[in-house]
Interface confidence: low
């Protein structure tokens, strides 16, 4: 029959033959030599009192005689050993000369062929009656993953033969498959921790440890769930797993008590316009609970203001908010506060920010347009709009003039300095309508355009115009 043994120190340069796949470190390479006295097991017994899967008797095409059944010899059924030990076991088979076609022996584990990192060696012992084949299998420094059912397969005369399984059981210290997880909990609120470890050997018993002291006097069978009624301060929990091989301790996990967040820091102004301020901040410590939202508090910094605070709410991320609908050329104090499920943080330090000057809020008034036929120009006049301080300093005007005639459309604009309240524009097209609009410009931007004033440019000397800042859809007053 077959044998199994555990070995501590074995050179892996044993003999290898046949097309059996496997892999070894290159400095331990067996060489093919079917006959050698080195490191051979004694030839197996030919008797088959415990045959495994058997190749049925077959009739050969030449001699027409019945071939005897072939099976793997009975081998050891169960190997128990400790982790990191070496193990060696084998399958053996006796094949009479009457069998013509045989393939190499392949090793299988739990139904899958072992093509990988395992050491397998096949040895042949021929005699007058046939050949005895021993397939040796060895695993150096066994691990838990080597646990399982191993067996040999071989094809004889196109029939597959399977050996009895050899069950390898690797025993070691308990192995954690579930360790307690770090959690953040509300003060004085119950929570659960789970610990699960396995052998072999079983059973595995669990002790819980809180801040270096055992929680349970009697061990619990794995898996174990510890219900903690509540904590008032941070604690460290771990679990001990015990079996016959010894003890393994899980990682220690911190259980934190949720508190309100720390105030945000580094509040900065990224950009200012006349009516908005873009503010950023760095969130403070979240208090072991995710930040849910933030509040931006804005108050006018001028002494004359009534001190009322505007509040703008936003999501906790991104740490950025554009405060809108602010007055132009105004000073504001800004602070940020954020909240988690426990509550609001204190506000950040207040910072000062200013909006820039705005664009004018009203258009120029009293617009008149007159055609100077002798010079072929339009004479445009207006009065300065009432510009507030926050609208900024007047820098000039933009005059938009649109010319329309049959088949022609021309849109033009001019900018003039703030000094005057009149401008002259050359006539672009005769026999056309010209629509004039004017807007005031400050450093803050361009204000609204005035209502359009229309004037008809005749072919010759006739002209109609509208001396008004109100809409003039057609010919109004005649000149």
């Amino acid at each position: 029959g077959g044998t199994a043994e555990k070995w501590e120190e074995t050179e892996l340069d044993q003999l290898f033959s046949g097309p059996l796949p496997g892999r070894l470190p290159v400095n331990h390479r067996p060489f093919s030599a079917p006959h050698s006295s080195r490191d051979q097991l004694p030839p197996p017994q030919t008797g088959r009192s415990h045959p495994a899967h058997t190749a049925a008797p077959q009739v050969t095409s030449t001699a027409s005689k019945l071939l005897p059944p072939v099976a793997f010899n009975h081998t050891i059924g169960h190997i128990v050993l400790s982790e990191h030990k070496n193990v060696k076991f084998n399958c053996s088979i006796n094949i009479p000369n009457t069998y013509q076609e045989t393939a190499g022996i392949s090793w299988w584990k739990d139904g899958k062929e072992l093509l990988g990192a395992h050491h397998s060696i096949t040895q042949f012992y021929p005699d007058e009656e046939g050949v005895s084949i021993i397939a040796l299998f060895s695993i150096a420094s066994v691990q838990r993953s080597d646990n399982g059912s191993y067996f040999c397969k071989m094809k004889v005369n196109n029939r597959e033969i399977v050996s009895d399984p050899i069950y390898v059981e690797v025993q070691g210290l308990p192995y954690f498959i579930k360790q307690p997880e770090s959690v953040n909990v509300t003060r004085n609120t119950a929570f659960n921790l789970t610990c699960q470890a396995v052998g072999p050997p079983e059973p595995v018993n669990i002790f819980w440890v809180q801040n270096s002291s055992r929680v349970n006097e009697k061990p619990e069978r794995s898996p174990s769930v510890l219900t903690v009624p509540g904590l008032t301060e941070t604690a460290v929990f771990s679990c001990e797993a015990h079996n016959d091989k010894g003890l393994t301790v899980s990682k220690g996990v911190h259980i934190n008590i949720k508190v309100i967040p720390s105030p945000p820091t580094e509040v900065h102004i990224l950009n200012s316009t006349a009516h908005s301020i873009l503010v950023s901040w760095v969130p403070g410590f979240d208090g072991y609970s995710p930040l849910q939202n933030c509040s931006i508090q804005v108050k006018e910094a001028d002494r004359l203001s009534n001190g009322s605070v505007m509040v703008f709410n936003t999501s906790a991320s991104p740490h950025l908010y554009e405060i809108q609908q602010l007055q132009a050329l105004a000073n504001y104090s800004i602070a940020v506060s954020c909240r988690n499920e426990i509550g609001w943080s204190a506000v950040s330090p207040w910072i000062l920010a200013s909006t820039t000057e705005g664009a004018p809020s009203v258009a120029p008034l009293n617009i008149t347009v007159f055609l100077n036929e002798s010079n072929n120009i339009l004479d445009i006049r207006w009065t300065k709009p009432p510009i507030k301080r926050q609208d900024g300093e007047l820098v000039g005007y933009r005059i938009s003039h649109v010319w329309e005639s049959a088949g022609t459309y021309k849109e033009l604009s001019e900018e003039v300095s703030q000094n005057g309240s009149w401008a002259q524009i050359p006539v672009q097209i005769h026999n056309a309508t010209c629509t004039v609009r004017i807007a005031a410009i400050t450093k803050g931007g361009i204000g609204p355009f005035s209502e359009p004033v229309n004037i008809i440019i005749p072919e010759h000397s006739k002209v109609d115009y509208a001396p008004s800042s109100t809409p003039a859809p057609g010919n109004t007053d005649s000149m």
């Epitope: 097309p19 059996l20 892999r23």
Partner: antibody, heavy 121, light 107 residues
Framework: QVQLQQPGAELVKPGASVKLSCKAS????????MHWVKQRPGQGLEWIGM???????NYNEKFKSKATLTVDISSSTAYMQLSSLTSEDSAVYYC???????????????WGTGTTVTVSS | DIQMTQSPASLSVSVGETVTITCRAS??????LAWYQQKQGKSPQLLVY???NLADGVPSRFSGSGSGTQYSLKINSLQSEDFGSYYC?????????FGAGTKLELK
């Protein structure tokens, strides 16, 4: 001397299948694993799988549903069938013989000339 | 699966220079490593097997070294016929994997 002969090119339509051949000569065909390797244009090498005439096949998981490896011992020829072809399968496919030094040293001392598979409608 | 990380991806060198290509395995492959050379439009050619052994007919200016997870291929006094792509490959079980390759170009 040891040789692995492969046809030069195959043009196939998307969704179709193609069966590539690799004829071995100069060594005992039944004693060695035959491997198949893919190389897309301008790319590196990808191992598809291997077949031993007397033992069985072993596939790269990535190609399990794409490639089927077979052998014809009588003609010392290895085959690889590629199914449900797409443009991703356009590549040069090599067969390669493992080294003679040992049965588990799966590196390749002899390569086929490669078959260029073009998948195009 | 074992990943093979090869560097550099490309190298521009002159004839007569010495170059070193490295290959890192994602786990110990116990010297089960081969190096190949491939020229444009040709099949790969075995250069080195078992990390350090030169294949038949490969010039002695090629040498392989390394163990564990780190391996390298050195080419002394580069010749014009040495330009092309180089690949490492592990054979420590299946699936076999190759490095992404190093392209050696003439400067």
């Amino acid at each position: 001397q040891v040789q692995l002969q492969q046809p030069g090119a195959e043009l196939v339509k998307p969704g179709a299948s193609v069966k590539l051949s690799c004829k071995a000569s100069g060594y005992t065909f039944t004693s060695y694993w035959m491997h198949w390797v893919k190389q897309r244009p301008g790319q590196g090498l990808e191992w598809i799988g291997m077949i031993h005439p007397n033992i069985n096949t072993n596939y790269n998981e990535k190609f399990k549903s794409k490639a089927t490896l077979t052998v014809d011992i009588s003609s010392s020829t290895a085959y690889m069938q590629l199914s449900s072809l797409t443009s991703e399968d356009s590549a040069v496919y090599y067969c390669a013989k493992r080294s003679p030094y040992s049965n588990y040293d799966w590196y390749f001392d002899v390569w086929g000339t490669g078959t260029t598979v073009t998948v195009s409608s | 699966d074992i990943q093979m990380t090869q560097s550099p991806a490309s190298l521009s060198v002159s004839v007569g220079e010495t170059v070193t290509i490295t290959c890192r395995a994602s786990e110990n492959i116990y010297s089960n490593l081969a190096w190949y050379q491939q020229k444009q439009g040709k099949s790969p050619q075995l250069l080195v097997y078992a990390a350090t052994n030169l294949a038949d007919g490969v010039p002695s200016r090629f040498s392989g070294s390394g163990s564990g997870t780190q391996y390298s291929l050195k080419i002394n006094s580069l010749q014009s016929e040495d330009f092309g792509s180089y690949y490492c490959q592990h054979f420590w079980g299946t699936p076999l994997t190759f490095g992404a390759g190093t392209k050696l170009e003439l400067k």
